[in-house]
Each structure stands twice: as structure tokens, then as C-alpha cells.
Interface confidence: medium
Amino acid sequence: QEGKFSGPLKPMTFSIYEGQEPSQIIFQFKANPPAVTFELTGETDNIFVIEREGLLYYNRALDRETRSTHNLQVAALDANGIIVEGPVPITIKVKDINDNRPTFLQSKYEGSVRQNSRPGKPFLYVNATDLDDPATPNGQLYYQIVIQLPMINNVMYFQINNKTGAISLTREGSQELNPAKNPSYNLVISVKDMGGQSENSFSDTTSVDIIVTENIWKAPKPVEMVENSTDPHPIKITQVRWNDPGAQYSLVDKEKLPRFPFSIDQEGDIYVTQPLDREEKDAYVFYAVAKDEYGKPLSYPLEIHVKVKDINDNPPTCPSPVTVFEVQENERLGNSIGTLTAHDRDEENTANSFLNYRIVEQTPKLPMDGLFLIQTYAGMLQLAKQSLKKQDTPQYNLTIEVSDKDFKTLCFVQINVIDINDQIPIFEKSDYGNLTLAEDTNIGSTILTIQATDADEPFTGSSKILYHIIKGDSEGRLGVDTDPHTNTGYVIIKKPLDFETAAVSNIVFKAENPEPLVFGVKYNASSFAKFTLIVTDVNEAPQFSQHVFQAKVSEDVAIGTKVGNVTAKDPEGLDISYSLRGDTRGWLKIDHVTGEIFSVAPLDREAGSPYRVQVVATEVGGSSLSSVSEFHLILMDVNDNPPRLAKDYTGLFFCHPLSAPGSLIFEATDDDQHLFRGPHFTFSLGSGSLQNDWEVSKINGTHARLSTRHTEFEEREYVVLIRINDGGRPPLEGIVSLPVTFCSCVEGSCFRPAGHQTGIPTVGM
């Protein structure tokens, strides 16, 4: 069978499974004169043989783990043993079978984890090796937690990355681990080959002892600080501590105060830097942050609460320079004249703001002193001794002392004695007829003038008239303003009129005095008037139930998913058709009838969130009036962006020859959402072949260091592939390339002869 098992001498590659006893020849080479015999050289390992006539075979089972490729040469010789053809390369690739079990590098691992550590952040790696080919399932390892001891309420506190062996806390572990309750745990971890998928896989186990350490990064108790402290500042008020020394502490004022009177030192001690004033601000909430040496937050911020304790540093204040009250001539003893309400800026409902009232002087003292009394705590003035006479004394002036426990303030009250209120207001007409208005009449319009008169003393509370609508306007669409000089009432529109809900309103007005009527006098029909308001229809645009509609969905929702809905009603009851405006990205469609909004394309938070479009509601029929509202779609992040280099790193170079191993630092980023702590990338070399020359080590969640392992580099450009994993759900990996040039240097810069100006590296390492 020419071609498959026999043929002329030429370079060839054969694949043979390891572990199999020889069952057939590999190949029969045919000699072309003057060649008569064949010779085999190279990595034969005394397994591969060629007979003089050209029959290539092997004499015992191969072992890929001893040698995965045998590089052989076959030459054709003439009768004198001189090579007349070849030698040509013959490559034997040994194919892997699963003949090696995985083994852990250690039979026991020990590690520690801090309580409340971030879920999913590895704190320990277990590592197993398998001599089989990692490019096949035979060498693909799968890690699993077999058991966790103790197991509380059947809840796993630990998890393992099946591929990397990274052990981290679960969300429950992050929340519930407590060294005071359980300081140590034991895990039994298994590793299987065949990617864990086959019943025929080999396995190994190891034991992991985990110590739980206390997390001392905790919010301190709320602090109370007395205002106006005269002690020397700054004063230490509390402290925070990161779990290890060397953290850089700072305070964050979320309220963005113009004056932020707190500071923190590099031990985590928190100080108030100046006296506080409770009346300016009675409580502060701010955050303490701990960062690493690169300025990356080490954990979540702690909330610090400071309550400012009151001292009595404010005197009572009067409501106005002079407070004026009126009292009718005939009022009886004990009647209330009015209440003086003084204020105190100190803390409410405490002794510091609790006020006492006392009359210290009455002028004139006619017909006697002590005509008035004031309730000590309420400040209510009452008539104390007798009814007053206007012709004797039309006005009294009182000096009232208002005091808290430390301060006294004098307030002044003027009491005007006025005529008795024995006349009621009388409307000039009892019926103001009909008034027809369109429903779109402007708010603030005066639609009617009404007038009542009162024969009591002018410009007193006995003759002043207040108009009230007592019937026919339960919605409060109308109001009445009174001119204090003429007692004219102006009926105005306060809220939009509405034909659909109130086409005809029978309005009733009442005219009253602010002063009480004397005993025996009552308001009667003369103090009431009416009018009829007729509202005519105006075709109005539909009305949305909200100015802004908001919905929240994950950015990876399937096309066709309902993402929200809007509703509008037409005042005239017409049907409504919905449409979208400003859907610049073409992501959405709206159901014209129901107002439901659906996705019609893949959404992308990184393109911008929230996504804002306008929704339009249009009358069907009629005059096709329309209204516009906003729809805001908030897109929640999913991990859909692999890490990449944060900037362009072309132009990195080392001066050749290297005198010592060198290193350079690079930064990664990705476009997904990273909350307070930022990304937590892991870094590794992109291919195994790079490991002899380079190593990559993580500095923090975003930065890593690429170092040379030796100094024996050629004078050329090397492209170093680096794998960056974001550890997200699901984890995404980016492979980036860092081009590093080794070049002759002049004064620390790459030297290029003339004519070699392209791509000159610009950054020396």
C-alpha cells in the first residue's frame, strides 16, 4: 500500500500512542538506486529500529512522560556505506494516555483568612501536578472541596476554583466566619484528572488547615463631642485600625462640608481639629478609608458617627421687636389675648432651650398694674383683673422677661384695646350669578370680585374680613385674597380647572372676622354668598402618570425582554398610541397599545448608563395631541469586558547587554463596573515557553511587575504575552502583549544607526 505504510525517503511525522505494545510497522522506506540500505540515527532510545531494507518499526511500548517527541533521522546508503540520500528528519510524536495520577505538592496545607474578607478573593492555593499532557483531558486537573469541618447549618464558608486551586470565602463565609466562635477549619480537597468529567479519572486528596483571624477593621462606636470645647485642639475622639501596620489612612467627607473639622493620622487615630457648634451642625457622618502604599483601598470604608452635645450657649430670642395683640373692650377675665412664642437655638426639649415667661413691667399702670398675666411656660397672655375700656387706655405696653436656665431676654408686647365685635360682615349681594370659563384658564387669574362690609371699628380684627369657600370646591381649585384696606375679595384660580371632573360647581362663600363675635351675636345668611362656575371643555393632550419612568435591568438581558412600561391617560378618554423618540442606539421598541418597552438589540452598560429616551403618548383620533415623558433605563453591570493594558506600552527597552536582571511595572484595567475597592486582577505569563526568561508578579489589584529571569538576552525585540484574569463572574481573561526591546544604549537611550528610525523605544528600564 504505497503512501500510507511505504514510500520514498522524505521528511515524515508519525503519531503513536504511548503504552501500547508494537503491533505493526511504522513505515517501509523504498530505496532508489544507487541506495541499497538505510540507517537510523537520533533519539532512538533503543526503541526505534530500521532494517537495512528500510523497514522502520519500534520494539517496545513508548512513554510520553519520558520523551514526548523522538527526533530521528533516516539516511539511504549505497553499497559502500556512503550516504546518497538524506538524512531526512523523521518525527515520532508520542500521544498521551491517562497513565499518571495527579498528586498534590503537599499532603497538608496551612493558611489563614481574615473574617469579613471579600468573597472570591483567594487567600491560599493548593497545587497538584499530573505528568500527563495538560493539552489533553488526561492532564487537565479539577479541584473540589470534599468536606468542610466544622460544617455549620450545612453552609459552605469556603470555595475552590476548580481550575486554579484558589481557595476563597463564599458570601456566607465572608459574613459569618467569626474567630470568637470558631477559630479554625479543616478542608479535605480532592483533585481529579480528565477535567473531573470521567469515571476513569485518577484522583488525590490533601488536607487544608485554615485559621480564622479577627478583622479589626471595624467601625468604632458613635462618638459624642461637647460643642464649643475650650480644650486645646486637635482632640483625639476615636480610632480605626487596619489589620496590619503600614496602611495609609484618610477621611472622606461625603457631605462635602465647607468646613470639615476632623482629621486622621497615620496610626488611624481620629481627631476633632476645632471646636464644634451644635447649632451649626448637630451630627457628622464621615468615612475612614485604609489604602495600601499604591493608594488602592484595602477594604470597604468605615462609617464614623459624631454627635455634637449641646451646651447652653444661646439666649432666648423674641419673635419680633414688638409683638402686637388686640383685645376687645368687653372681653372677660381669663380670655386669651395671644401667645408670645420666643425661640432658643439650643437643643429642643432640653433644659438649655426650656423657656420661662414673666411680665416685668406694664405701662401705663391704668386703671391699675397687673391687668395681664402670662403663663410661665406657655407664654399665653390672659386678661387678669377686669375688662378694659378703650376710652381710658387704648394701648398697653408690656415688657416680658423670657429666660432659659442661664440667659434672660426682654421682649416687648403692644396690646391694642379695640371696639367690641358686635357687627357681622354683610355681603353686598348674596348671589354673584353664573361665570363660564374654559378649563385651560391660567392659574392665578382673578375670575370674580366679591365684597362684604363690617360696621365695627375700622382696621381692627373686629372689622377685618376673611373670605372662605365653604362649599363646592373640595379640590381647592379656587382661593380668595382680601384687600386689607377695602375688604374686597378677589377670587383666583389656584389649581387647573377640569371639565372632565367638575363641569359645574356651586360655590358658597363665608365672610368672617378674625376676632370672635360678642356673646349673643352670630353669623347669619348675610355673611354668605354664592356663585355658579361653569367650565367648558378644551381638548387636552394625554397625561403621563409620571414625569420620568425608570427601570433597571442587567446589561446581558436577552433580546425581546420586557425592560419597562409607561402609562398615560387622555383626559377626554380617547385611546392612546405610544412611541419612542431619541432611541439613538436602536436598543428599544415600545408596544404602541400597552406602553410596554422591550429590548431589540444587545444592551451595553459600558456604552452609557442610564440610557435615556423619550416616550410620546398621542391621542388616537381627535386632534392627535401628544405629550412627552422620559424613560431612563439603568443597566446593571455584568462581567463582559476582559482586562486590557491601561495604556500604550510600546517603547519599553532594556540596555543591552543587561548587567543585572531588570523589571518594569505595568497597569491593567477593564471597562466593567468596579465598586469601592476597584478591580482585583491576577497576572500570569501567556505561555509556558516564556517562563525561562520572564516572570510576572502581582503588586496589587491593577498593577504587576514583569521581571527578567537572567541577563542573557539577544539584542532584539521580545514580545511578552501576559494573561490577565479579572476574577469576575464569570471570570474573563485577556492576553496582552508587552513589546520589550533589548538595544545598545547611548546615554541611557536606545541607539539606532541612521535609517533605522522606525519604532524607536522611548522608555528605558
Epitope: I216, R241, P245, G246, E267
Partner: nanobody, 118 residues
Framework: QVQLQESGGGLVQPGGSTRLSCVSS???????MGWFRQAPGKEREFVAL????????EYSDDVHGRFTVSRGNTQNSVNLQMNNLKPEDTGIYYC????????????WGQGTQVTVSS
């Protein structure tokens, strides 16, 4: 290896006084130093703690007002002056280096015996 070396203690009459000293073989920035004790048949308990700067001291309720913790001649040493001793103060006294309070001990001394008895 870093070591803590305690000295002092021994047999003391009730009502009497003694002074314990502790020196660390290395200076720890930002770490606090203090004392713990373990009475026979009991768990080790907190006694006193001195902040790294030496400006804050903390005591257990049992010893407050009787014991005083102070910095030694150097930044890496700490003393415990024990006055008005009671029989219940008997135990092994351990020097400790902590960070962030009494519950986070990072390094223990070997301990020194204090016996209060007539």
C-alpha cells in the same frame, strides 16, 4: 527570630508590690505592647496595654488603679508596676506585642511567674 524576654516577679506578700519588665529583640513600628496573665486552671486573660506612642494605656477592670503600664528606657520595652497585690493576682504573666487591640496578639513572651502569698 524575634523574641520577647520577661523579667521580674517571683513571690510577693499580699498588699505588696513588684515590677515586671519586658524587652523585645526588635522594635515594632505601630505595634502596641502589653501584658496578659494566666492563673492556674484558667484561660489567659488581658491585663494591660500601652499604645505604640505611649500616650494611651488600657487596663482590665480587675487591675485598674493598682497596676501601671509604662514604656521602658527604649521603644521596644514595656514595664508593669503592680501595687496592692492580691492572692488572685497569682499566675504566669506574659508580655505580648499586639496590633489593633488586645484581641490581636502577634507575638508572645515565655512568661514569668508571680505568686502572691503570705
Amino acid at each position: 527570630q524575634v523574641q520577647l524576654q520577661e523579667s521580674g516577679g517571683g513571690l510577693v506578700q499580699p498588699g505588696g508590690s513588684t515590677r515586671l519588665s519586658c524587652v523585645s529583640s526588635r522594635t515594632f513600628s505601630y505595634y502596641d505592647m502589653g501584658w496578659f496573665r494566666q492563673a492556674p486552671g484558667k484561660e489567659r486573660e488581658f491585663v494591660a496595654l500601652l499604645s505604640w506612642r505611649g500616650n494611651n494605656a488600657e487596663y482590665s477592670d480587675d487591675v485598674h488603679g493598682r497596676f501601671t503600664v509604662s514604656r521602658g528606657n527604649t521603644q521596644n520595652s514595656v514595664n508593669l508596676q503592680m501595687n496592692n497585690l492580691k492572692p488572685e493576682d497569682t499566675g504566669i504573666y506574659y508580655c505580648a506585642v499586639t496590633y489593633g487591640g488586645a484581641r490581636s496578639v502577634r507575638l508572645w513572651g515565655q512568661g514569668t511567674q508571680v505568686t502572691v502569698s503570705s
